[in-house]
């Protein structure tokens, strides 16, 4: 219909025409991890904020149990950003029991699962080598892609370690999708 | 037809809808940066070119003062880039007097003013530590993310250290928001 | 009004409306990538799926030999990542007769090509110098941004060093465009 | 090779309007703006007004503000400035000139590239 | 707006000669200002960008200096071919505005 006078008779029909303020949105942002127990060779999914300060879901997409719910089928643009943060510091809150707070790798992974397939698809990873030299190092990794998801699908947020993930500030660490 | 009820036959009412091309954009590129007095534990703001090579604002999103202008309330994709560079020669132009050009961190925030509201709210934190070897390092950080904005909404980027940024080129160093 | 006709009366004149599900997208992932002869100064582009796994596209946006083309003038959303690996073990797959595989730095430029003029003009460049000290190395860049695009336009990437692509999964290294 | 080629001479009466056209070739057009100079007989050059070819925004002189316009089709690769109601001191040479700008912020750059020039005469 | 002044207004030199043109600026246009040759019945063209930059093609004879305020056009060495009128023009702020030209003619 692109440059022309829009204005149809009775007897034509159109292709579905929406409000752009009626599509499923949402951004969501960190909040502090919960330590989880997660299978060996799959990592854990990050939780989030969906309701305070900037984080919304509207318009259907709703947010439950680490997951953003896709509630119509179309094309979204998904993205994530996650900000890692390691301290050599012995006492520091986020050094994980056990673990060297300086990683070889870190890695950000947005995944899809759908009910009728076992199998998650990971839709877009970040993954960097880490060389810092300092004792406390931080950086983030950014993901954002288009994707053609169906109702029901669902969208989660996986990082290589939870402990290296910086929660402190809900503009360092979020998720977010939308309908285009 | 923002905001006007839109029942073209007197049996329907439909929601408001609009054509894509008069959403308000704006897609800003990076200018040498002026020196500029900023307060102490405030980061300063860029400014930013507008309207010359791949720069441009459209639909009432207008650019004035290191700002974008939101002219409608509405959710928006915001996104930014800054490549950082450092170089470790005395006579290098970007360097700034009195202060070590090899800092411990780079930082950019896209932040929102909004005039009835005295303090700003950052919208996107990239932070990263630096710990580069050589004598010339460079690096972006990019941002991108998805808000609900209010008519009268200011948006600015702020660096942590203005004489870092690299202005050279219009495809490095960017600043944009459209509406959803 | 999603699924619903749309047949307003005769007296009322709208601006052009369309279905957001017809608008040209795509969706490209990364494929292994076939030595290329480049001339000197210029990157060389990389060829990607259209339309196997992730890969989609859509609405006459069409694929072909290394250019994503525009079907329709308009505002876009580009967006690119490019996950760079080094390694220094000599047999290494991806390490490239004599270039060293540790380089200076790794560059990735989203550029597009006018038939009616010879020269091509970058819109975005994520670049970004290496010191990774580890003998294995890798890392992403990230970029994505607006532009007001021409029917006819052909867009590309290009890297510094095609050997450094990670081209092992379709989620590391990835193309998109979509009207907006 | 990169050039602007411009309509040719005009003679109106004093009131009415004229529109001189500007066509590119050998470069992308959607990236320079265009500018329009004339030059009185005699004068020297008087900046009239400029025009993004990339999404239409223009900059008018406050002189001309609400007697000029200027457009662009991209499909064509042409840009075009309107001048309405004509005076005798509107006769000039009006030139169309590209707007370079070399993708960094540290330039502004200048007009590199220019029309021939169009004689506009008015006269009753 | 901001106004450009140029001096002189005309002036008469000879071949081999070193000729300066200066232009004033009402407020400081950073380093936006452009330099223009123009010969009779011909379309300007474009010498030094950005004050001190020379467009392309330009001979090496053309320079320009100055920031802020006050900007200077050099020919080292006049040559018959430069007899013409020069123009500066800041690119600072809209409207773009020119100086009212330096007549440079043969002594």
């Known amino acids: 219909l692109k440059g022309q006078e829009f204005a149809p008779s009775h007897q034509q029909v159109y292709a579905p025409l929406r409000a752009d303020g009626d599509k499923p949105r949402a951004h969501l942002t960190v909040v502090r991890q919960t330590p989880t127990q997660h299978f060996k060779n799959q990592f854990p999914a990050l939780h989030w904020e969906h309701e305070l300060g900037l984080a919304f879901t509207k318009n259907r997409m709703n947010y439950t149990n680490k997951f953003l719910l896709i509630p119509e089928s179309g094309d979204y643009f998904i993205y994530s950003q996650v900000t890692f943060r390691g301290m050599t510091s012995e006492s520091s809150e986020i050094r994980q029991a056990g673990r060297p707070n300086k990683p070889d790798s870190i890695t950000v992974v947005i995944t899809k699962v759908t009910d009728s397939y076992p199998e998650p698809t990971q839709l877009l990873m970040g993954t960097k080598s880490v060389s810092e030299v300092g004792s406390n190092w931080f950086q983030p990794i950014y993901l954002g892609a288009m994707f053609s998801l169906q109702e029901g699908d669902k969208l989660m947020v996986n990082v290589s370690d939870i402990s290296l993930v910086d929660y402190t500030k809900e503009d360092k660490t979020f998720f977010g999708a939308f309908l285009l | 037809l923002k905001g006007q009820e839109f029942a073209p036959s007197h049996q329907q009412v439909y929601a408001p809808l609009r054509a894509d091309g008069d959403k308000p954009r704006a897609h800003l590129t990076v200018v040498r940066q002026t020196p500029t007095q900023h307060f102490k534990n405030q980061f300063p703001a860029l400014h930013w070119e507008h309207e010359l090579g791949l720069a441009f604002t459209k639909n009432r999103m207008n650019y004035t003062n290191k700002f974008l202008l939101i002219p409608e309330s509405g959710d928006y994709f915001i996104y930014s880039q800054v490549t950082f560079r450092g170089m470790t020669s005395e006579s290098s132009e970007i360097r700034q007097a009195g202060r070590p050009n090899k800092p411990d961190s780079i930082t950019v925030v896209i932040t929102k003013v909004t005039d009835s509201y005295p303090e700003p709210t950052q919208l996107l934190m990239g932070t990263k530590s630096v710990s580069e070897v050589g004598s010339n390092w460079f690096q972006p950080i990019y941002l991108g993310a998805m808000f609900s904005l209010q008519e009268g909404d200011k948006l600015m980027v702020n660096v942590s250290d203005i004489s870092l940024v690299d202005y050279t080129k219009e495809d490095k160093t960017f600043f944009g928001a459209f509406l959803l | 009004l999603k699924g619903q006709e749309f047949a307003p009366s005769h007296q009322q004149v709208y601006a052009p409306l369309r279905a957001d599900g017809d608008k040209p997208r795509a969706h490209l992932t990364v494929v292994r990538q076939t030595p290329t002869q480049h001339f000197k100064n210029q990157f060389p582009a990389l060829h990607w799926e259209h339309e196997l796994g992730l890969a989609f596209t859509k609405n006459r946006m069409n694929y072909t030999n290394k250019f994503l083309l525009i079907p329709e003038s308009g505002d876009y959303f580009i967006y690119s990542q490019v996950t760079f690996r080094g390694m220094t073990s000599e047999s290494s797959e991806i390490r490239q007769a004599g270039r060293p595989n540790k380089p200076d730095s790794i560059t990735v430029v989203i550029t597009k090509v006018t038939d009616s003029y010879p020269e091509p003009t970058q819109l975005l460049m994520g670049t970004k110098s290496v010191s990774e000290v580890g003998s294995n190395w890798f890392q992403p860049i990230y970029l994505g941004a607006m532009f007001s695009l021409q029917e006819g336009d052909k867009l590309m990437v290009n890297v510094s060093d095609i050997s450094l692509v990670d081209y092992t999964k379709e989620d590391k290294t990835f193309f998109g465009a979509f009207l907006l | 090779q990169v050039q602007l080629v411009q309509s040719g001479a005009e003679v109106k009466k004093p009131g009415a309007s004229v529109k001189v056209s500007c066509k590119a070739s050998?470069?992308?057009?959607?990236?320079?703006?265009i500018s329009w100079v004339r030059q009185a007989p005699g004068q020297g050059l008087e900046w009239m007004g400029w025009?993004?070819?990339?999404?239409?925004?223009?900059h008018y002189a406050r002189m001309l503000q609400g007697r000029v316009t200027m457009t662009t089709d991209t499909s064509t690769r042409t840009a075009y400035m309107e001048l309405r109601s004509l005076r005798s001191d509107d006769t000039a040479v009006y030139y169309c000139a590209r707007e370079n700008y070399y993708g960094s912020g540290a330039y502004r750059g200048g007009m590199d590239v220019w029309g021939q020039g169009t004689t506009v005469t008015v006269s009753s | 707006d901001i106004q450009m002044t140029q001096s002189p207004s005309s002036l008469s030199a000879s071949v081999g000669d070193r000729v300066t043109i200066t232009c004033r600026a009402s407020q400081s246009v950073s380093s936006y200002l452009a330099w223009y040759q123009q010969k009779p019945g011909k379309a300007p063209k474009l010498l030094i960008y950005?004050?001190?930059n020379r467009a392309t093609g330009v001979p090496s004879r053309f320079s320009g200096s100055g920031s802020g305020t006050d900007f200077t056009l050099t020919i080292s060495s006049l040559q018959p071919e430069d007899f013409a009128t020069y123009y500066c023009q800041q690119r600072s702020n809209w409207p773009w505005t020119f100086g009212q030209g330096t007549k440079v003619e043969i002594k």
């Open positions: 025009i993004s070819t990339y999404n239409g925004n223009t």
């Open positions: 050998g470069y992308d057009f959607t990236y320079y703006g």
């Open positions: 950005d004050a001190s």
